[in-house]
Amino acid sequence: QGQDRHMIRMRQLIDIVDQLKNYVNDLVPEFLPAPEDVETNCEWSAFSCFQKAQLKSANTGNNERIINVSIKKLKRKPPSTNAGRRQKHRLTCPSCDSYEKKPPKEFLERFKSLLQKMIHQHLSSRTHGSEDS
């Protein structure tokens, strides 16, 4: 049950990213750290970098509400038990500032890519009976 809910939440984050991609022109065109080709065991660290990034609505009015709600939902913190190997490897993972900075469109695309990778890994670990999530 908990594992299923975890997967639903991760997929939900992809849906939120997809919704925000519809509004890239309404986001502040700021360059944000956007992890790519994240090394194994640093996925949760990179995930945390995406969540910390200051993605913001440009307050143009029309879609401000849905953008702000979506950004806030993107920052929902998973329980630490879901961080898998994060604790063990945190010290060896790149800092958020070390990742290449990208505008909102590419930032969201890279976030989606990471989420997809994490979902794939999660499913694989379940298939192979691993404890990691």
Partner: antibody, heavy 126, light 106 residues
Framework: QVQLVESGGGVVQPGRSLRLSCAAS????????MHWVRQAPGKGLEWVAF????????YYADSVKGRFTISRDNSKNTLYLQMNSLRAEDTAVYYC???????????????????WGQGTTVTVSS | EIVLTQSPGTLSLSPGERATLSCRAS???????LAWYQQKPGQAPRLLIY???TRATGIPDRFSGSGSGTDFTLTISRLEPEDFAVYYC???????FGQGTKVEIK
């Protein structure tokens, strides 16, 4: 069982104020965002306001912005709608509704309003 | 702000028939953000479908939702007497409702 009960409706003159309450029971109120939705006589549904589960963010429909204030008291499991400078066009049945997306990672995940109260009627008339 | 346009305004059908309700958005909506509600006279609305196609708890399987982008559909495969009501689509996050489709007995 999961329940929302609104109160505080009534007849009020234009320009006056009214405060609606919504008592929640049967669920962890502090884990859910909450909405007010209204329905004028013979009309469709109109979203009015939303408050985040912890009260940290509030959103309003343009038609009520600056006049209505949504708030909550998680210790009392109660949602409020303070309505000031009331107008004839505010006449409606007011519903409180639970947002189906829980703040809990393992909680409910519905992007919709999954629990509704029975509604309380507000009539603005001189 | 997004506008949701429902059609038809009224659908006159007989019990046992299939009902197809449309909801068109003025800009693209992620499927996760589209919900459908049912409202009967004198009652509060009830969540039917969330995520464009997932039935809410306790909703019979004769109700189904589909669509993506700007076009969404609610289908009632065989109308039961209790299904005659008004149906609303909604975009989550902006919480905008469509104007509603009334399904009435022919």
């Amino acid at each position: 069982q999961v329940q929302l009960v609104e109160s505080g409706g009534g007849v009020v003159q234009p320009g006056r104020s009214l405060r609606l309450s919504c008592a929640a029971s049967g669920f962890t109120f502090s884990s859910y965002g909450m909405h007010w939705v209204r329905q004028a006589p013979g009309k469709g549904l109109e979203w009015v306001a939303f408050i985040w589960y912890d009260g940290s963010d509030k959103y309003y429909a343009d038609s009520v912005k600056g006049r209505f204030t949504i708030s909550r008291d998680n210790s009392k499991n109660t949602l409020y709608l303070q309505m000031n400078s009331l107008r004839a066009e505010d006449t409606a049945v007011y519903y409180c509704a639970r947002d189906g997306d829980s703040s809990d990672w393992y909680g409910d995940y519905y992007f919709g309003m999954d629990v509704w109260g029975q509604g309380t009627t507000v009539t603005v008339s001189s | 702000e997004i506008v949701l346009t429902q059609s038809p305004g009224t659908l006159s059908l007989s019990p046992g028939e299939r009902a197809t309700l449309s909801c068109r958005a003025s800009q693209s909506v992620s499927s996760s953000y589209l919900a459908w509600y049912q409202q009967k006279p004198g009652q509060a609305p009830r969540l039917l479908i969330y995520g464009a196609s997932t039935r809410a708890t306790g909703i019979p399987d004769r109700f189904s939702g589909s669509g993506s982008g700007t076009d969404f559909t609610l289908t009632i495969s065989r109308l039961e007497p209790e299904d005659f009501a008004v149906y609303y689509c909604q975009q989550y996050g902006s919480w905008t409702f469509g104007q509603g489709t009334k399904v009435e007995i022919k």
